[in-house]
């Protein structure tokens, strides 16, 4: 009997408001045994996969997606999904990334505190569950 997969969560480090040219890392979390984490942008047409999974806790795994130099075009909605054989999970909630021009003032913080989106009751499309990840994956430029 197939297990019910918990919805992933998504967060951003150092936060969700990022100065132009700074870096941001999206962190996706799911259960132990995840083979592939996918970070989706706005819709499923733009995404990035990783199989570089590590432990977040005894009961959770995580993957990180780093954008080295944030551009205005990186602003938008992001969410996570994962593949734990033999099926895909539901999507996480969306997390919105905002890109601001650096003010450079000594008193203005560069980012807002880290923000995350975990499971909620929002309905979610399960059609991913039929498909395994593409065997060749995707290059980073598909998303970044």
């Amino acid at each position: 009997q197939e297990e019910d997969l918990p919805r992933p969560s998504i967060s951003a480090e150092p936060g969700t408001v990022i100065p132009l040219g700074s870096h941001v890392t999206f962190v996706c979390r799911g259960p132990v045994g995840v083979q592939t984490f996918r970070l989706e942008r706005d819709s499923r047409s733009t995404y990035n996969d990783t199989e570089d999974v590590s432990q977040a806790s005894p009961s959770e795994s995580e993957a990180r997606f780093r954008i080295d130099s944030v551009r205005e075009g990186n602003a938008g909605l992001y969410r996570c999904i994962y593949y734990k054989p033999p099926k895909w999970s539901e999507q996480s909630d969306y997390l919105e990334l905002l890109v601001k021009e650096s003010s450079g003032g000594p008193d203005s913080p560069d980012t807002e505190p880290g923000s995350s989106a975990g499971p909620t009751q929002r309905p979610s499309d399960n059609s991913h569950n039929e498909h395994a990840p593409a065997s060749q994956g995707l290059k980073a430029e598909h998303l970044y």
């Epitope: 996969d49 570089d52 990180r64 060749q136």
Partner: antibody, heavy 117, light 107 residues
Framework: EVQLVETGGGLVQPKGSLKLSCATS????????MNWVRQAPGKGLEWVAR??????????YYADSVKDRFTISRDDSQSMLYLQMNNLKTEDTAMYYC????????WGQGTTLTVSS | DIQMTQSPASQSASLGESVTITCLAS??????LAWYQQKPGKSPQLLIY???SLADGVPSRFSGSGSGTKFSFKISNLQAEDFVTYYC?????????FGGGTKLEIK
């Protein structure tokens, strides 16, 4: 078909150096962490080193027994994994395996290192 | 470092029987545990990951259980090709330590 092929093993004198290579194919190398594991003759398995992906700043980790002597590296453009081994000791004599992470699901056939005078 | 204590070091059994191998972690690792099979002169092969998940292509007579610090690995209906060596490994934190191995011998 996933393939990992290690090369570069051989006979080296103590305090010598050697570089092992692992050519990979059949999977997306640049999104996978990679490991080296070794097995001394007639002994059990010992994890040696791990390297993560660009998303994780190519972070590296080592067993205490090889720290400061071995260096793991990767070339994503060529789907290659390497292990530079310096100041070799007789106890480094082993079969060295290249292994895909994080679940160690694919292993190469291994390459043999013998450290002896 | 997390120590993995695997037992027994060797075990004799007959064809068709079941055997169970145990692995104890020196601290909690959740379900970050894998089991491998190694045939003489061959590379290890992943059988079980995440303590209970069967790797691709592995027969269902292999199974894993446990979480936290105590883990078990069971082979049901032993076949001739199963009489080889098995290892556990924790994947919770580096160094990713292995158990000492269990050699299955035919009775």
């Amino acid at each position: 078909e996933v393939q990992l092929v290690e090369t570069g093993g051989g006979l080296v004198q103590p305090k010598g150096s050697l570089k092992l290579s692992c050519a990979t194919s059949g999977f997306t190398f640049n999104i996978n962490a990679m490991n080296w594991v070794r097995q001394a003759p007639g002994k059990g398995l010992e994890w040696v080193a791990r390297i993560r992906t660009k998303n994780n700043n190519f972070a590296t980790y080592y067993a205490d027994s090889v720290k400061d002597r071995f260096t793991i590296s990767r070339d994503d453009s060529q789907s290659m994994l390497y292990l530079q081994m310096n100041n070799l000791k007789t106890e480094d004599t082993a079969m060295y395996y290249c292994v895909r992470g994080p679940y160690f699901d694919y292993w190469g056939q291994g390459t043999t290192l013998t450290v002896s005078s | 470092d997390i120590q993995m204590t695997q037992s027994p070091a060797s075990q004799s059994a007959s064809l068709g029987e079941s055997v169970t191998i145990t692995c104890l972690a020196s601290q909690t690792i959740g379900t970050w545990l894998a089991w491998y099979q190694q045939k003489p002169g061959k590379s290890p092969q992943l059988l079980i990951y995440a303590a209970t998940s069967l790797a691709d292509g592995v027969p269902s007579r292999f199974s894993g259980s446990g979480s936290g610090t105590k883990f078990s690995f069971k082979i049901s209906n032993l076949q001739a090709e199963d009489f080889v060596t098995y290892y556990c490994q924790q994947l919770y934190s580096t160094p990713y330590t292995f158990g000492g191995g269990t050699k299955l011998e035919i009775k």
